[in-house]
């Protein structure tokens, strides 16, 4: 999905009210200094597709983060303020219900949030293209 | 806990050049923008630039006419600001600040250098 | 660049009363504005961030509110600790620009 015409505005008020809050709360008790950011982005649009790919594509050691709070708001956001994301989303969603599994926050998911946390970071403050 | 420790005060002649550093601890140096924002006696804030000390990006007000230098050392969990061709409208408390956890703010702020331009 | 100017430049406030300081943007930043707090001597601390959003720590007697080019901090009721400059800063284009900043005073 080409996320360039996204209403980044809007997307960002989301996160601020609600996404972030539950990143932290899904932090917590993990100690600020526990992860390095390895995956940057340089502008809203990669940014966008990063936080999408990390957020809802399993990975090894990490398979549930999908259906935590912050995901089921970050793809509520995504659907509404970008024009036709809900439609490519369809058979992504039909595969990932197949592969459900239960909840597990293992270290490899901390990481990842925390490498959410910093793309959202650069999202919300491109440094070097202000959009 | 998050510190800013920045060196100490300095006295410059007009023309010359001086490097401001600022020392980060408790958090995770690479992940975090660094700012910094300087204070003339008696007046308001002033943004001078901005670094993200992991890929070593940086965003300068155009103000300072390429005048600032700012840089980081991540193996010493460091930024450093260099200002040149100084002036005495230069005289002023210089800051460092981290952004925080959004990215719309900055929540640590170093306790200040002051820089003093005099011949 | 976008200018943030603030009014008034000084304030007097009875202690336990309202206070009120506006910022005014030169051109629309959104909701990208940011309060700071400086007492005399210190560094400035972070009171708001994006116009409403408390900071960890900041008591609620702070508020902000506006978008677009109008903003306001208000203290709902004033504490002699709040006794300081305050700032307004947009992040919403580079450069980044702060207001010139309200002295708060007690009556």
């Known amino acids: 999905y080409d996320f360039t015409n996204c209403d980044f505005e809007k997307i960002k008020a989301a996160y601020l009210s609600t996404i972030s809050k539950d990143l932290i709360t899904y932090m917590s008790g993990t100690k600020s200094t526990e992860f390095n950011n390895t995956v940057s982005c340089s502008n809203r649009p990669h940014c966008l597709t990063e936080i999408q790919s990390l957020t809802f594509n399993p990975t090894a050691g990490c398979a549930s983060l999908a259906k935590e709070m912050f995901a089921m708001k970050t793809k509520a956001a995504l659907a509404i303020w970008c024009p036709g994301y809900s439609e490519t989303q369809i058979n992504a969603t039909q595969a990932m219900k197949k592969r459900r599994k239960r909840k597990v926050t293992t270290n490899k998911c901390l990481e990842q949030v925390s490498q959410l946390q910093g793309l959202w970071r650069r999202f919300n403050r491109p440094l070097l293209k202000q959009q | 806990e998050v510190q800013l420790v920045q060196s100490g005060a300095e006295v410059k002649k007009p023309g010359s050049s001086v490097k401001v550093s600022c020392k980060a601890s408790g958090g995770t140096f690479s992940n975090y923008l660094i700012e910094w924002v300087r204070q003339a006696p008696g007046q308001g804030l002033e943004w001078m630039g901005v670094i993200d000390p992991g890929v070593g990006d940086t965003n300068y007000n155009e103000n300072f006419k390429g005048r600032v230098t700012i840089t980081a050392d991540k193996s010493t969990s460091t930024a450093y600001m260099e200002l040149s061709s100084l002036r005495s409208e230069d005289t002023a408390v210089y800051y460092c600040?981290?952004?925080?956890?959004?990215?719309?703010?900055?929540?640590?702020w170093g306790q200040g250098t002051t820089v003093t331009v005099s011949s | 660049d976008i200018v943030m100017t603030q009014s008034p430049d000084s304030l007097a406030v009875s202690l336990g009363e309202r206070a009120t300081i506006n910022c005014k943007a030169s051109q629309s930043v959104s909701s990208d504005v940011t309060w700071y707090q400086q007492k005399p001597g210190q560094s400035p601390k972070l009171l708001i961030y994006?116009?409403?959003n408390h900071y960890t720590g900041v008591p609620d007697r702070f508020s902000g509110s506006g978008s677009g080019t109008d903003f306001t901090l208000t203290i709902s009721s004033l504490q002699a600790e709040d006794v300081a400059v305050y700032y307004c800063?947009?992040?919403?284009?580079?450069?980044?620009?702060f207001g010139q900043g309200t002295k708060l005073e007690i009556k």
């Open positions: 600040a981290r952004e925080d956890n959004t990215g719309t703010a900055f929540d640590y």
């Open positions: 994006y116009v409403s």
């Open positions: 800063q947009q992040h919403h284009r580079f450069p980044l620009t």
